[in-house]
């Protein structure tokens, strides 16, 4: 997270951190019992790798009461998914069990209804990435409240230009904005999961090219049919 | 498929008015900006300016922005181009372009022709 | 605003002859967000113009590997390593990098 802040401590019970081989990789976001929704691209290059998810955590380093790491039993990208485009950047990660919910432990609704989200709407985004642009890694929970741009702003020759479909969403990137390590975390805005962080190798910060990230509601029948 | 349609072109005398169209289909109205491009007989491309879709926001190229003004109905997903006090040197085909990938998608043109 | 400055204004070429195009911006079309957003156009009379290049050397999808862009800063070519018959056309050069957006005053390449 770019010009944020650090998060109180477990006050997004939802927050997930997706790891590989013990070390934190991408965001993701508890939205069922037994499923971690994240960015399909992070799982790419784990190849034999151990994919687990921590839950419960502010910092990835100390010891936390309601910490805990769980085992990914499957693992499910959308079948759309290709490595080169950011179209369909979703996963669907299954835990070995039910998670033990708790105050710091939570799963968090997700939008249902396909409409897009008004510009401008102030909506927060949290992870664990890079926090400047030397790519220091925060052992605590960051976040940073963004706007929601308008998609034909964003898909400007200047910004992405085309590359925004009805199933992506944006927001600004003035010195404020998700980054590297972010991907697969959640954009939250009135409380309800709108979007997952994309997880391309987008230049973070730069105003021009706008925070790109998957819109749930376009999933809905997707997860749905997953988490059945 | 992408289509942009002008219509709205013809024959007007100087000083007089006309109203262009722009009717898009073939993908979603409000995602992308909509841009104006002129051509007069035998001479090269002139911007004339932009719109936002969603907010409706304006972007004029000096040389128009005192006679010209860009209009939406999302409705219809249409764009508009009033054009006030023609001169002779108006006289050109006018086309909408949809600004993203770049000016991929234009429409065929209509021909404003400003003449007594 | 920027001046976009296309050479020749014309050219007679046959076909299977490398033909080059250049524009050169009266300065630099580098965008602030680091990218260069000089565009390429091919226009045929009594049509609208299609999109070849963009963002200086990117071929737009269905365009023809005989089509190449080059250039950076100021100074930008349009290539086409073979010419065709159905390339004979007026070719455009664009920048989007700065408000107004502005086009070079196009190259007619007709038959020798």
């Known amino acids: 997270i770019l010009g944020g802040r650090e998060a109180e401590a477990h006050a997004r019970p939802y927050m997930a951190s997706v790891q590989l081989n013990g070390a934190h990789l991408c965001g993701g976001v508890l939205v069922a019992e037994q499923w971690v929704l994240s960015a399909a691209h992070c799982l790419e290059d784990a190849a034999d790798g151990k994919v687990q998810v921590l839950l419960g955590a502010h910092s990835l380093s100390q010891p936390e009461p309601s910490k805990r790491l769980y085992d990914v039993l499957r693992a499910v990208p959308h079948p759309d998914s290709q490595p080169d485009t950011i179209d369909h950047d979703l996963l669907l990660l299954q835990l070995s069990e039910k998670a033990t919910l708790g105050p710091a432990v939570r799963p968090l609704p997700w939008q249902r209804v396909d409409r897009d989200v008004a510009p401008g709407t102030l909506c927060d985004v949290a992870g664990w990435g890079i926090v400047n642009h030397a790519g220091r890694r925060p052992d605590s929970l960051q976040h940073v409240l963004l706007p929601v741009l308008d998609r034909a702003t964003c898909n400007r020759r200047t910004h992405h230009d085309g590359a925004i479909t009805e199933r992506l969403m944006c927001a600004e990137s003035n010195r404020r904005d998700s980054c590297k390590g972010d991907s697969g975390g959640p954009l939250v805005c009135g409380g309800v999961l709108e979007g997952v962080v994309t997880s391309g190798s987008r230049v973070c910060g730069n105003r021009k090219k706008p925070g790109i990230y998957t819109r749930v509601a376009s999933y809905a029948a997707w997860i749905d049919s997953v988490l059945a | 498929e992408v289509q942009l349609v002008e219509s709205g072109g013809g024959l007007v005398q100087p000083g007089g008015s006309l109203r262009l169209s722009c009717a898009a289909s073939?993908?979603?109205?409000?995602?992308?900006?909509m841009n104006w491009v002129r051509q007069a007989p035998g001479k090269g491309l002139e911007w004339i300016g932009d719109?936002?879709?969603?907010?409706?926001?304006?972007d004029y190229n000096a040389d128009f922005k005192r006679r010209f003004t860009f209009s939406l109905d999302t409705s219809k997903s249409t764009a508009y181009l009033q054009m006030n006090s023609l001169r002779a040197e108006d006289t050109a085909v006018y086309y909408c372009?949809?600004?993203?990938?770049?000016?991929?998608?234009w429409g065929q043109g209509t021909l404003v022709t400003v003449s007594s | 605003d920027i001046q976009l400055t296309q050479s020749p204004s014309s050219l007679s070429a046959s076909v299977g002859d490398r033909v080059t195009i250049t524009c050169r911006s009266s300065q630099t079309i580098v965008h602030s967000n680091g990218d260069t957003y000089l565009e390429w156009y091919q226009q045929k009379p009594g049509k609208a113009p299609n999109l070849l290049i963009y963002k200086v050397s990117n071929r737009f999808s269905g365009v023809p590997s005989r089509f190449s862009g080059s250039g950076s800063g100021t100074d930008f070519t349009l290539t086409i390593s073979s010419l065709q018959p159905e390339d004979f056309a007026t070719y455009y050069c664009f920048q989007g990098s700065h408000v107004p957006v502005t086009f070079g005053q196009g190259t007619k390449v007709e038959i020798k």
């Open positions: 073939g993908y979603v109205f409000t995602s992308y900006y």
């Open positions: 372009t949809r600004e993203g990938p770049s000016f991929a998608y």
């Open positions: 719109i936002n879709p969603v907010t409706g926001d304006t």
